[in-house]
């Protein structure tokens, strides 16, 4: 994998001696152009050979409060004829994302960063034949 | 192009807390201190009919400082014979993720939330004809 370095004199945000509590502005900045974010065809989930559905996961004490989670529609993949191909499996592509969770009963507001593993979509992989011992 | 978006209203008015000062909250980021970056499940990237590679970007001003982004290996998909099928397209599945971006004034402990569109993996889709106006 290619590594794109960015040098800086500031301590790395993940260094051992970095602050444990930081101030975060909750106004969300969008580093994507508006055009880019609108250019994600939502129909990939239907046109894919490994189609998926999206399920709403909601938590009012979390930011983002709504997260859409993918689930593969079939165990197998769909071939060119629209039939299930028993040599190919639909598998979920998962991504670890960051969320902010509000600490209970905290005033002023305190949050903690949590990692969450979410299903983003599905891909089609060749079935592995297990070799008997 | 950076577009400021609305903040986190649901989180701002929870409980009987006073309103937030400057939209800022305290965040505990200790979760990162044991674990560099966001991990990516890699077991499907080579077996998929729409295989992909990862590019790792490093940015010390960002939380997480390391992010792996997928890049589809081919424009078409790989068929059962291991050949590229140009009647199908390998497309990147994208996920909007949150990162913490250090505020620009030096090595401060102030951060802002930023949305990023991350390519997580690839899936194989059947192309459709563009409907001309």
């Amino acid at each position: 994998a290619a590594i794109i370095p960015q040098s800086s004199a500031c301590p790395n945000t993940e260094a051992k001696d970095f602050l444990q509590n930081v101030k975060v502005n909750l106004k969300v900045f969008n580093s994507l152009g508006a055009k880019v974010s609108s250019r994600r065809p939502s129909d990939y989930l239907n046109r894919s050979t490994s189609p998926w559905t999206l399920h709403r996961n909601e938590d009012p004490d979390r930011y983002p409060s709504v997260i859409w989670e993918a689930q593969c529609r079939h165990q197998r993949c769909v071939n060119a004829e629209g039939k299930l191909d028993h040599h190919m499996n639909s598998v979920l592509i998962q991504q670890e994302i960051l969320v902010l969770k509000r600490e209970p009963e905290s005033c002023p507001f305190t949050f903690r960063v949590e990692k969450m593993l979410v299903g983003v979509g599905c891909t089609c992989v060749a079935s592995i034949v297990r070799q008997a011992a | 192009r950076k577009n400021p978006k609305a903040g986190v209203p649901a989180l701002q008015k929870a409980g009987n807390c006073p309103p937030l000062e400057d939209n800022t909250v305290r965040v505990d980021i200790r979760i990162f201190n044991q674990n560099q970056g966001i991990s990516v499940p890699r077991e499907f990237q080579n077996r998929s009919s729409s295989p992909w590679d990862y590019n790792i970007t490093r940015d010390p001003h960002r939380f997480p400082s390391e992010i792996a982004e997928a890049q589809c290996r081919h424009s078409g998909c790989i068929n059962a014979q291991g050949q590229e099928d140009s009647t199908m397209n390998s497309v990147a599945i994208q996920q909007e993720i949150l990162v913490l971006r250090r505020e620009p004034q030096g090595c401060s402990n102030s951060f802002r939330l930023e949305k990023m569109l991350l390519k997580v993996g690839c899936t194989c889709v059947k192309p459709i004809v563009h409907q001309a106006a």
Partner: antibody
Framework: EVQLVESGGGLVQPGRSLRLSCAAS????????MHWVRQAPGKGLEWVSG????????GYADSVKGRFTISRDNAKNSLYLQMNSLRAEDTALYYC????????????????WGRGTLVTVSS | EIVLTQSPATLSLSPGERATLSCRAS??????LAWYQQKPGQAPRLLIY???NRATGIPARFSGSGSGTDFTLTISSLEPEDFAVYYC??????????FGGGTKVEIK
């Protein structure tokens, strides 16, 4: 008016470079994958290279691989072909063509063509 | 690489006659075959895609048929503007845009 206009062709010596441009107008450029197709004088059509809407998918004919580079600038509604190490057999009329795939993906059929720009490689 | 062979190389017909052009693939391209028309000094124009689908604005006298390795473009009744060179193109196998050598339809 929906159109593609190629430019940058001309007479060039073998081994030298040339950069072709294609200006698109009358349609949303980044809704489409784009291609270069060439036609040698008095001959048939040969696909040269293609690029999808966000440059995430790129393909080349074996005859130009490693010598030609396709690129696009969506902000400028422009498609480019950087041609290096030119050979006599690259002499042709170079057409810019729009793919008919939806969402800027490849369909590999060409629904709109420019008038072409002539590249002559000769010493 | 798939080779597309078009026949005949030249077809001499009169306006009003029926034209039948053939395109044969060296291996199956399923139904992923297109037809283009090119007039002298002009760019090609897409007529038919995926063997039998007429492109936008193409008159009904143009029709395509076939699948696998054998394909036909039929012009039911030739108009004066139909005299041109016709190319077939496959998108089934890599490289995904290989063209046939062309058939010239000329006035008899």
């Amino acid at each position: 008016e929906v159109q593609l206009v190629e430019s940058g062709g001309g007479l060039v010596q073998p081994g030298r470079s040339l950069r072709l441009s294609c200006a698109a107008s009358g349609f949303t450029f980044d809704d489409y994958a784009m291609h270069w197709v060439r036609q040698a004088p008095g001959k048939g059509l040969e696909w040269v290279s293609g690029i999808n809407w966000n440059s995430g998918g790129i393909g080349y004919a074996d005859s130009v691989k490693g010598r030609f580079t396709i690129s696009r600038d969506n902000a400028k509604n422009s498609l480019y072909l950087q041609m290096n190490s030119l050979r006599a057999e690259d002499t042709a009329l170079y057409y810019c063509a729009r793919d008919m795939g939806g969402f800027g993906e490849f369909y590999w059929n060409f629904g709109l063509w420019g008038r072409g720009t002539l590249v002559t490689v000769s010493s | 690489e798939i080779v597309l062979t078009q026949s005949p190389a030249t077809l001499s017909l009169s306006p009003g006659e029926r034209a039948t052009l053939s395109c044969r693939a060296s291996q199956s391209v399923r139904s992923y075959l297109a037809w283009y028309q090119q007039k002298p000094g002009q760019a090609p124009r897409l007529l038919i895609y995926d063997a039998s689908n007429r492109a936008t604005g193409i008159p009904a006298r143009f029709s395509g048929s076939g699948s696998g390795t054998d394909f036909t473009l039929t012009i039911s009744s030739l108009e004066p503007e139909d005299f041109a060179v016709y190319y077939c193109q496959q998108r089934s196998n890599w490289p995904p845009a290989t063209f046939g050598g062309g058939t010239k339809v000329e006035i008899k």
